[in-house]
Interface confidence: low
Amino acid sequence: EVEKTACPSGKKAREIDESLIFYKKWELEACVDAALLATQMDRVNAIPFTYEQLDVLKHKLDELYPQGYPESVIQHLGYLFLKMSPEDIRKWNVTSLETLKALLEVNKGHEMSPQVATLIDRFVKGRGQLDKDTLDTLTAFYPGYLCSLSPEELSSVPPSSIWAVRPQDLDTCDPRQLDVLYPKARLAFQNMNGSEYFVKIQSFLGGAPTEDLKALSQQNVSMDLATFMKLRTDAVLPLTVAEVQKLLGPHVEGLKAEERHRPVRDWILRQRQDDLDTLGLGLQG
């Protein structure tokens, strides 16, 4: 209504402070200057605005920055970030890791939203590759982040970034993703000694070829069954009974419990019964 468009006398906001929570939506629209809001964005998060009031503040910023917000504003969006659409975020140019961290903090504990996915995409594309600091940050907030990337996107991850990856970050990776990550991990950890190397490479072994598994079997690594079960079937099939026994060490007894599951099932069927009998586990080829 026409009479609501003008700011009532004495209500013009001189700064962003708690008094604004008592303003109706139309009063916020009429009495808060967008440029003032932009320069004092860091104060917004300390004020318990309703979601409706935040909508008004977002609208004011949208009008002030139709081509997309500057990073100085983005860094201080706080909870207002939750109001942004992927379309809004696609207009942004986020270059600072601190800005990324600030916005991820707002979404902390939540699953990755389309807004966050768009933000990360914009940030990574702007950097040109997924560097170690970025990967460190992203996997800290979203342990499943790495596995949400396509094999093509993963190919841009430099080997140096692999040091940031924790075992749980690979929980949901499929074999195609591990095929890309494993060679990078092998390169990243190549200067480590045997036992340390195995600890680091273990999570990536779902992408390992047969020859690497054969090499590991000569190093007394004692691979656990959970890791063995994630190996590529085509990589496991050529292994001999002796090689699997050396690879698993004391964990070899676990083969019995997994004899009906891949890759154990398929591997058993490839072996001579005489060789299987040497394990003493009652495995039937």
């Epitope: 504990g109 939540h110 075992p167 749980q168 929980d171 959970a226 599951h261």
Partner: antibody, heavy 119, light 107 residues
Framework: EVQLLESGGGLVQPGGSLRLSCAAS????????MTWVRQAPGKGLEWVSG????????YYADAVKGRFTISRDNSKNTLYLQMNSLRAEDTAVYYC????????????WGQGTLVTVSS | DIQMTQSPSSLSASVGDRVTITCRSS??????LAWYQQKPEKAPQSLIY???SLQSGVPSRFSGSGSGTDFTLTISNLQPEDFATYYC?????????FGGGTKVEIK
């Protein structure tokens, strides 16, 4: 056929502890995130806790944080819920459920086990 | 936390009726919504995930729609075995939260 079988429920005094188990069969257990959901008598469903495939990531509802611990043993195809410092308001049927097509949605549920906290 | 509000809390209907249950979230959740059916003394069963995707083995008379904050579960040709309580659940963010339930009773 996927089957989830809960056990370990029963009557316990306030402040006491219980450990629930959920034995899974008919699925590659180590490939799925799992969760516990509870239902107080005559009430609706309430999510309690969730765990990633390796057990490396866990989530809890505020009402149980610090008192309940979710864990899993992939070699035994079993999910656990250790419940300490139990309160009357924890009285409920506890269901374990398997992650569905998306993390957070659940396509298979166990039949539930009743936990009663009373003096 | 995201609040999920279902309506109505109960309804009476006859076999063959078209039944609609709505679920509203306190903030936008995209399409991250599931629907479950629960019969007395039984565990819940998954009907719909991702707001509109039918769970394998669920009859096609069940359908889901919506995104953002407003969602609907529709049963197009109510059958005797459909009399039960229905719950929506958001999985956009932790903690995961359920609606209060809608009990569908025989008229």
């Amino acid at each position: 056929e996927v089957q989830l079988l809960e056990s370990g429920g029963g009557l316990v005094q306030p402040g006491g502890s219980l450990r629930l188990s959920c034995a899974a069969s008919g699925l590659t257990f180590r490939s799925y995130a799992m969760t516990w959901v509870r239902q107080a008598p005559g009430k609706g469903l309430e999510w309690v806790s969730g765990i990633s495939v390796s057990g490396g990531i866990t989530y809890y509802a505020d009402a149980v944080k610090g008192r309940f611990t979710i864990s899993r043993d992939n070699s035994k195809n079993t999910l656990y819920l250790q419940m300490n410092s139990l309160r009357a308001e924890d009285t409920a049927v506890y269901y374990c459920a398997k992650r569905g097509a998306a993390v957070g949605s659940f396509d298979y549920w166990g039949q539930g086990t009743l936990v009663t906290v009373s003096s | 936390d995201i609040q999920m509000t279902q309506s109505p809390s109960s309804l009476s209907a006859s076999v063959g009726d078209r039944v609609t249950i709505t679920c509203r979230s306190s903030q936008g959740i995209g399409s991250w919504l599931a629907w479950y059916q629960q019969k007395p003394e039984k565990a819940p069963q998954s009907l719909i995930y991702a707001a509109s995707s039918l769970q394998s083995g669920v009859p096609s008379r069940f359908s889901g729609s919506g995104s953002g904050t407003d969602f609907t579960l529709t049963i197009s040709n109510l059958q005797p075995e459909d009399f039960a309580t229905y719950y929506c659940q958001q999985y956009n963010s932790y903690p995961l939260t359920f609606g209060g339930g809608t009990k569908v009773e025989i008229k």
